[in-house]
């Protein structure tokens, strides 16, 4: 902390320019008014302060404001952003999407710093649910910011939030949060036409349960590998070989390539290996010809 | 709580064929959701999947021992099966049979050792 | 085959430590990852599934993260009772593969 001494005469600070940058951190402190840095703040971000002169001048917006800065200064912090740790971003209270956005450009670039996700937090709590700009915005300056979220967190997002996510940022997203997503999905392009909605629906079909893939190859989506790939195993283990085919299309011939890994290979041992020869694929591991398969999805539904 | 219980001989000759057998109580082989695994850990050493059966007869085995492997199921007795041919002083381990949930790991057997040799 | 890779493959600690095990994929394997514990002479427990799903009856200080070819095991606050060998699997390809091993020993 910088002990209080008196401004030398001349010296008082009467606006915030370029001056300042001459001036001891004992200067800063003595001759630079609190209110008068508050009112200029915008000013702050043009001036190369050091990082010991931007120090002083956080401690005295610090003392100006010990409950938390007024949304007033925080939309013109710029740099001095970086200078906040979560502590004191908990004390404010964020509400604009113009102040969000101005301290996510200061840390563009850069991962998400305990600072940024402290600043989200606040700024979602206090709207109640993650909207669509919001959302937007996010995931403009991070692209994995959803897959950061936790299934609870996701349960907040509405459907029609959901128009502002794009297939990379589901990317990084596991299939529990898919769980959350795909259902907000579903009801938010239900009205769009068959292929429109699958070009939408793909990114969150992780997420599906068995009976929408039983639909959807009804729909000749043809499906690629990938998509296929990211399926719930669960979701994939009822489809029969002909609903896989259906799905999946001319993309059939890639089962070959991954019929050692999930979901694939747990598909396989459930099918009948002269249903698999009807691809001619030369998959492998079906279950063998002439073996009795009782249904036991009942018994263990009851067990 | 299902349990899994392996059994078999201790000591195997070079040359001969390994067998072993896993009996399951408070569960059944005949479940849809699990697959049977045999995995094994030479001592002192790391583990390694030998192979699996699933209730319908449809096998997986790792490609390294595949040409001497055999894995079966009798869903009668529920139990399942290891048959490793050809074996040498390499296969001194400890066999641990497991039940494996396609999406939930692995739950093991105690283990039995079995020795190679003459 | 899928090389599970662990580090470190063995680290001393005290009770009360926080310990951090990792373990890499050759490739990716989705979340397809679990967690086991192995003590002398005992048959391996599983610990965390699905990378980062906590076992039935597994004490909560145990905590899986990670997607894709990084995972990590976090033990918050070490326990005598978990002084053991730790090993990652992968389920997501045949054939199936375990890490070499973690020894956490003790300091």
């Known amino acids: 902390e910088v002990e209080k001494t008196a401004c030398p005469s001349g010296k008082k600070a009467r606006e915030i320019d370029e001056s300042l940058i001459f001036y001891k951190k004992w200067e800063l402190e003595a001759c630079v008014d609190a209110a008068l840095l508050a009112t200029q703040m915008d000013r702050v971000n043009a001036i190369p302060f050091t990082y010991e002169q931007l120090d002083v001048l956080k401690h005295k917006l610090d003392e100006l404001y010990p409950q938390g800065y007024p949304e007033s200064v925080i939309q013109h912090l710029g740099y001095l952003f970086l200078k906040m740790s979560p502590e004191d971003i908990r004390k404010w209270n964020v509400t604009s999407l113009e102040t969000l956005k101005a301290l996510l450009e200061v840390n563009k670039g850069h991962e998400m710093s305990p600072q940024v996700a402290t600043l989200i937090d606040r700024f979602v709590k206090g709207r109640g649910q993650l909207d669509k700009d919001t959302l937007d915005t996010l995931t403009a300056f991070y692209p994995g910011y959803l897959c950061s979220l936790s299934p609870e967190e996701l349960s907040s997002v509405p459907p029609s939030s959901i128009w502002a996510v794009r297939p990379q940022d589901l990317d990084t997203c596991d299939p529990r949060q898919l769980d959350v997503l795909y259902p907000k999905a579903r009801l938010a392009f239900q009205n769009m036409n068959g292929s429109e909605y699958f070009v939408k629906i793909q990114s969150f079909l992780g997420g599906a349960p068995t009976e929408d893939l039983k639909a959807l190859s009804q729909q000749n989506v043809s499906m690629d590998l990938a998509t296929f790939m990211k399926l719930r195993t669960d979701a994939v283990l009822p489809l029969t070989v002909a609903e896989v085919q259906k799905l999946l299309g001319p993309h059939v011939e890639g089962l070959k390539a991954e019929e050692r890994h999930r979901p694939v290979r747990d598909w396989i041992l459930r099918q009948r290996q002269d249903d698999l020869d009807t691809l001619g694929l030369g998959l492998q591991g079906g279950i063998p010809n002439g073996y009795l398969v009782l249904d036991l999805s009942m018994q263990e539904a009851l067990s | 709580q299902v349990q899994l219980q392996e059994s078999g001989p201790g000591l195997v000759k070079p040359s001969e064929t390994l067998s072993l057998t896993c009996t399951v109580s408070g569960g059944s082989v005949s479940s849809g959701s699990y697959y049977w695994s045999w995995i094994r850990q030479p001592p002192g050493k790391g583990l390694e999947w030998i192979g699996y059966i699933y209730y319908s007869g449809s096998t997986n085995y790792n490609p390294s021992l595949k040409s001497r492997v055999t894995i079966s199921v009798d869903t009668s007795k529920n139990q399942f099966s290891l048959k490793l041919s050809s074996v040498t002083a390499a296969d001194t381990a400890v066999y641990y049979c497991a039940r494996d949930h396609y999406e939930r790991g692995l739950y093991w057997g105690q283990g039995t050792l079995v020795t190679v040799s003459s | 085959d899928i090389q599970m890779t662990q580090s470190p493959s063995s680290l001393s600690a005290s009770v009360g430590d926080r310990v951090t095990i990792t373990c890499r994929a050759s490739q990716s394997i989705s979340s397809y990852l679990n967690w086991y514990q192995q003590k002398p002479g005992k048959a391996p427990k599983l610990l965390i599934y699905a990378a980062s799903s906590l076992q039935s009856g597994v004490p909560s200080r145990f905590s899986g993260s990670g997607s894709g070819t990084d995972f990590t095991l976090t033990i918050s606050s070490l326990q005598p009772e978990d002084f053991a060998t730790y090993y990652c699997?992968?389920?997501?390809?045949?054939?199936?593969?375990f890490g070499g091993g973690t020894k956490v020993e003790i300091k």
């Open positions: 699997q992968q389920s997501y390809s045949t054939p199936l593969t």
